[in-house]
Amino acid sequence: NQDLPVIKCVLINHKNNDSSVGKSSSYPMVSESPEDLGCALRPQSSGTVYEAAAVEVDVSASITLQVLVDAPGNISCLWVFKHSSLNCQPHFDLQNRGVVSMVILKMTETQAGEYLLFIQSEATNYTILFTVSIRNTLLYTLRRPYFRKMENQDALVCISESVPEPIVEWVLCDSQGESCKEESPAVVKKEEKVLHELFGTDIRCCARNELGRECTRLFTIDLNQTPQTTLPQLFLKVGEPLWIRCKAVHVNHGFGLTWELENKALEEGNYFEMSTYSTNRTMIRILFAFVSSVARNDTGYYTCSSSKHPSQSALVTIVEKGFINATNSSEDYEIDQYEEFCFSVRFKAYPQIRCTWTFSRKSFPCEQKGLDNGYSISKFCNHKHQPGEYIFHAENDDAQFTKMFTLNIRRKPQVLAEASASQASCFSDGYPLPSWTWKKCSDKSPNCTEEITEGVWNRKANRKVFGQWVSSSTLNMSEAIKGFLVKCCAYNSLGTSCETILLNSPGPFPFIQDN
């Protein structure tokens, strides 16, 4: 049909933190290269129907469905989704093609389905069909990598049984401590599965796919380091592989390394040794202890000994099931408005946890730091001095853990007032929770010193959103005070705040803040 326009359908994926994705469904900003969706004419359909290739979208992803129409003259359009019509504003690009867009922000289940676009041009009418579904990430997995010895070679293979297939990389560092942080210049990354250079100080393997990134460190005892006060501890689940590396450097080759489990030499086939000369001609030896699939009886003290270095041990504990050990009792904190303060949770867990900090239904990233004693710690400092309930949640494959914190900010009360025909109420969220006084202002008491005690009702309520307490005081109106100014004052150890209310007949009530 010569009259049919040339149509192009494209999908634009937006990065999730992309501020360029606007609310408008007509002029989205392109943030990724568009993907052609084909848009073929659908055979045997009544009318002219184009069908775009099916679109699979991750949950929470933001996308734009876009149609480019090469047809003379003006066009008008209408989007229909689940029997609802949606506004459609075509515009023209630099090549004078009609452009129609539908922006879907933060994809959810309810936004999945068929999107129909009806276009009317001067020459003809036609329909374009988009089918949008959520990618089934339930089948996705991301498993922590583990190590295997490469057959007949002194090399380690890093394996992560994940779906989709992950990208595997080795993360190597040759300096000590803090300088081995991920983005440090001392860190070298190698995007490959096999590693031959096994003499480095710190060796990790990481696997990443759509679900994120998981890493496993090669557990190492360095005999040139002074023995730690706390014996290093390694947890494994039954069936997992055990790998421990013992490393030692000496001025010459005249030393050997041995592994023992509970004072018995490891069986042949459960260890292998490598050695090399370093740049300053000292000899580096490493001895790996490994068990391809651990059982309960592999638990115990693994000791690496050398004829030229102090021996060192690690306690290997084999568990049936993962765990998270921490105290889950809730904790309350009271701090000043400008005091520096962080929440912290100390825990021991295996496998490593995934965690979040939550405040007021908003989640914050959670960082964990390993301590020398086998525990880890997570701190949260980004509370911006907002009082309320903070929640730490952690989970791994086998366990879940939640801990509640309450943050109270010491501050002088701030009073808000409201009134009706029958009563006046004052509210304050100062901390410590304030006490209340009501005073009547009259000719006899122009400074409002005449205290009102009758008809006053105080209460504290939990403001659910932030989990913070709000104190209120209500004065029931009596004939004795109608038409007078009254003053409610909230006071605590940090100060007093008052509000003056005119108790007149029903109608708007003026409030005068008086601090």
């Epitope: 014996l231 004072n263 003290y301 000791t303 000994s305 004829s307 102090p310 021996s311 041990s313 306690l315």
Partner: nanobody, 111 residues
Framework: QVQLQESGGGLVQAGDSLRLSCAAS????????IDWYRQAPGNEREWVAQ???????FYADSVKGRFAISRDNAKNTVYLQMNSLKPEDTAVYYC?????WGQGTQVTVSS
């Protein structure tokens, strides 16, 4: 139940000697290496010396040439002979086998 008991600490003058003992029970003593550590007030616990089960000895740089570690497997005891003591050797001295620690013995060196 592994138990370690240190003894032999006390108050001495700088330049004097002391001999600490660590008696062990509940552990295959002859099959274990033993470490001595010390902790001065306000400081971290620091490693001092080790004797391996084969009798090899190792020392922290700060005590090399002055301290000597030895063991008597028949008595399940390890000794730390401390000579030419200095005020900076003042600390509580602990012995350790694997994750097991003794209660410690106080050594005070006055100048």
């Amino acid at each position: 139940q592994v138990q370690l008991q240190e003894s032999g600490g006390g108050l001495v003058q700088a330049g004097d000697s002391l001999r600490l003992s660590c008696a062990a029970s509940g552990v295959t003593f002859s099959a274990s290496y033993i470490d001595w550590y010390r902790q001065a007030p306000g400081n971290e616990r620091e490693w001092v010396a080790q004797i391996t089960r084969g009798g090899d000895s190792f020392y922290a740089d700060s005590v090399k040439g002055r301290f000597a570690i030895s063991r008597d497997n028949a008595k399940n005891t390890v000794y730390l002979q401390m000579n030419s003591l200095k005020p900076e050797d003042t600390a509580v001295y602990y012995c350790r086998v694997l994750s097991y620690w003794g209660q410690g013995t106080q050594v005070t060196v006055s100048s």
